[in-house]
């Protein structure tokens, strides 16, 4: 089978010097010596499929998957990962081998999976499969913390079943809303597992280890606050513990709190109460509702009632499996060059998602913000007005979600030209996609007004660079125009740009660019 190309697959492990992080390149960075991954032909597969040895990577490590192709002529390629196409830029090394690279910076769970590389050479088409997983570093895990009541004490214990043993801290805040942001002076952190002061406004427990940091908020209903006008909703998976705190303040001790599930009082053993006097001698009461391991029938409206306050409810929904609910239809946007614009995804998910925004093989951090109606939103504004395809990817323990966005930037065409002995071609990336005209410059037409219509072939969007369409126009050489200057012009609603080409001149072609607004 001598037609098949000689293929070498290698893994390059990068020393994580942070200067390289964030760069997406087809060239290797500072690295250890490459490790050969074998790349054997997969038997009994439809089509030509090479399979590289499985790659195990440490969390946060940076690697390059690289393929060296010893095959004559040009090659084109495409990477596919989790149903998303990623651009591929082959180059040639000193031995004239085609080199295709995929750089993975700061490896995360999200980036683990199968990477497929499709290569098209002049002789044949073939596929190379890489399987990348996170090294099972002593089964490192980081689980979201949960609460338990301390035996015989009015206190909560925060537990995170993680490896290595995590550092557990309580994050407490006594003000409302924005001022409870992590780095705010109103926030107090206590690095301990047990918490006795349970009267605060906002109580969270966080666990952190080598894998990062996970937090759980103590779900609270405050009877002194106006309720959210959309009923608060709490999701839990079967078997997880349920904790809801009801809090109320009154001028004196003459009030009581009760919990009901769907208008039936909670059974004893599923709640406990604490009370204290605040600095201004008002009485604060809190009543916890808890279920150590929820079942489907714990779903429903939990209502906290008081003899002196309006009651408030939360809808607790018990699910078998986590989920991510959002519309995954792709969205196209068209903006001006200086217009402020952010992509946004609105979703409902449980457990909380981990997410990334990706553009041109580069991943960007993803921030999530909770909305009042139980939904969350992630926005991405850092596109720097670069047109192309942007990908939002989210996952939690049970579900994955990907959404594609295309950003088009309205701008005047910019023309690049190239020519060969038989034809001249012009390319433009303006948007809306430009239309083309070719003109001949001669003694009769020194201003190049004589239009050429014969032998012109326009191709709209023949090359997709990270989702950015490029339009081209080709003029086939004829005796009538040999030796003449010709002008190709691309125009759209924002302007015109032209390039002048001398046809059939020896040596490098002189190009003269002229822009017309």
């Amino acid at each position: 089978n001598q037609d098949l190309p000689v293929i070498k697959c290698v893994l390059i492990n990068h020393k994580n010097n942070d200067s390289s992080v964030g760069k997406s390149s087809s060239y290797p960075m500072v690295s250890e010596s490459p490790e050969d991954l074998g790349c054997a032909l997969r038997p009994q597969s439809s089509g030509t499929v090479y399979e590289a040895a499985a790659v195990e990577v440490d969390v946060s490590a940076s690697i390059t998957l690289q393929v060296l192709v010893d095959a004559p002529g040009n090659i084109s390629c495409l990477w596919v990962f989790k149903h998303s196409s990623l651009n591929c830029q082959p180059h040639f090394d000193l031995q004239n081998r085609g080199v295709v690279s995929m750089v993975i910076l700061k490896m995360t769970e999200t980036q683990a999976g199968e990477y497929l590389l499709f290569i098209q050479s002049e002789a044949t088409n073939y596929t190379i499969l890489f399987t990348v997983s996170i090294r099972n570093t002593l089964l490192y895990t980081l689980r979201r913390p949960y609460f338990r009541k301390m035996e015989n004490q009015d206190a909560l214990v925060c537990i995170s079943e993680s490896v290595p043993e995590p550092i557990v801290e309580w994050v407490l805040c006594d003000s409302q809303g924005e001022s409870c942001k992590e780095e705010s002076p109103a926030v107090v952190k206590k690095e301990e597992k047990v918490l006795h002061e349970l009267f605060g406004t906002d109580i969270r427990c966080c666990a952190r280890n080598e894998l990062g940091r996970e937090c759980t908020r103590l779900f609270t209903i405050d009877l002194n606050q106006t309720p959210q006008t959309t009923l608060p909703q709490l999701f839990l998976k079967v078997g997880e513990p349920l904790w809801i705190r009801c809090k109320a303040v009154h001028v004196n001790h003459g009030f009581g709190l009760t919990w009901e599930l769907e208008n039936k009082a909670l059974e004893e053993g599923n709640y406990f109460e604490m009370s204290t006097y605040s600095t201004n001698r008002t009485m604060i009461r809190i009543l916890f509702a808890f279920v150590s391991s929820v079942a489907r029938n714990d779903t429903g409206y939990y209502t906290c009632s008081s003899s002196k306050h309006p009651s408030q409810s939360a809808l607790v929904t018990i699910v078998e499996k986590g989920f991510i609910n959002a519309t995954n239809s792709s969205e196209d946007y068209e903006i001006d060059q200086y217009e402020e614009f952010c992509f946004s995804v609105r979703f409902k998910a449980y457990p909380q998602i981990r997410c990334t925004w990706t553009f041109s093989r580069k991943s960007f951090p993803c921030e999530q913000k909770g909305l009042d109606n139980g939904y969350s939103i992630s926005k991405f504004c850092n596109h720097k007005h670069q047109p192309g395809e942007y990908i939002f990817h989210a996952e939690n323990d049970d579900a994955q979600f990907t959404k594609m966005f295309t950003l088009n930037i309205r701008r005047k065409p910019q023309v690049l030209a190239e020519a060969s002995a038989s034809q001249a071609s012009c390319f433009s990336d303006g948007y809306p996609l430009p239309s083309w005209t070719w003109k001949k410059c001669s003694d009769k037409s020194p201003n190049c007004t004589e239009e050429i219509t014969e032998g012109v072939w326009n191709r709209k969007a023949n090359r997709k660079v990270f989702g950015q369409w490029v339009s081209s126009s080709t003029l086939n050489m004829s005796e009538a125009i040999k030796g003449f200057l010709v002008k190709c012009c691309a125009y759209n609603s924002l302007g015109t740009s032209c390039e002048t080409i001398l046809l059939n001149s020896p040596g490098p072609f002189p190009f003269i660019q002229d822009n017309i607004s």
């Epitope: 009877l223 106006t226 006008t229 429903g300 409206y301 002196k308 306050h309 309006p310």
Partner: antibody
Framework: QVQLVQSGAEVKKPGASVKVSCKAS????????MHWVRQAPGQGLEWMGI????????SYAQKFQGRVTMTRDTSTSTVYMELSSLRSEDTAVYYC??????????????WGQGTLVTVSS | DIVMTQSPDSLAVSLGERATINCKSS????????????LAWYQQKPGQPPKLLIY???TRESGVPDRFSGSGSGTDFTLTISSLQAEDVAVYYC?????????FGPGTKVDIK
């Protein structure tokens, strides 16, 4: 029995403010939310906002944000609605309405008799 | 905001006959998994404040005659007066309390034919 008694009719000039009161009796005042709803002459009903009589915190419809303030006085079991920068479109009957709370927050079992506010130059 | 629409704008029904009013919301006002529908119906007579008839789309308020019934779920709801009486002449409003701002339908005027 439950009663919500509102203050009398008011005539105001454009740009002025009006403060309507609603005195509750026949139930524990702090146990139920109070809403304000208005109705322009011959028109439908429009929700303005909600106040928690226990804590005093309030939430307003976006349309009225910055112009409306809802307050309460627990010693007299009274809620107040003040609307500023009045314009002719604010001519309406203003109702206070009690809310059951809990999962049902948002529908109204008892209403005041209404206060007609006329804005005219 | 959730927009509520009602049909018809008005209707005239003979005494003792059935009157049906429809209400539609611009998005679902049903809260799964309990599938409760956040919809209330009110009756308003001239010069009076509205009176609560139905909540949770189909639960009758105490003291409301059983000729009034509510049905529907999701986005489509109906108020039915099974046997119209003279004292039922009024304007009827539907209202969603699923999310803020709480919004009312434009009203349906019921008269006797």
């Amino acid at each position: 029995q439950v009663q919500l008694v509102q203050s009398g009719a008011e005539v105001k000039k454009p740009g002025a403010s009006v403060k309507v009161s609603c005195k509750a009796s026949g139930y524990t005042f702090t146990r139920y939310y109070m809403h304000w709803v208005r109705q322009a002459p011959g028109q439908g009903l429009e929700w303005m906002g909600i106040i928690n009589p226990s804590g005093g915190s309030a939430s307003y419809a976006q349309k009225f944000q910055g112009r409306v303030t809802m307050t309460r006085d627990t010693s007299t079991s009274t809620v107040y609605m003040e609307l500023s920068s009045l314009r002719s479109e604010d001519t309406a009957v203003y109702y206070c309405a009690r809310d059951l709370g809990g999962a049902a927050a948002g529908y109204f079992d008892y209403w005041g008799q209404g206060t007609l506010v006329t804005v005219s130059s | 905001d959730i927009v509520m629409t009602q049909s018809p704008d008005s209707l005239a029904v003979s005494l003792g006959e059935r009157a049906t009013i429809n209400c539609k919301s611009s998005q679902s006002i049903s809260h799964s998994p309990n599938t409760r529908d956040y919809l209330a119906w009110y009756q308003q007579k001239p010069g009076q404040p509205p009176k609560l008839l139905i909540y949770w789309a189909s639960t009758r308020e105490s003291g409301v005659p059983d000729r009034f019934s509510g049905s529907g779920s999701g986005t489509d709801f109906t108020l039915t007066i099974s046997s119209l009486q003279a004292e039922d002449v009024a304007v009827y409003y539907c209202q969603q309390y699923y999310s803020s701002p709480f919004t009312f339908g434009p009203g349906t005027k019921v008269d006797i034919k």
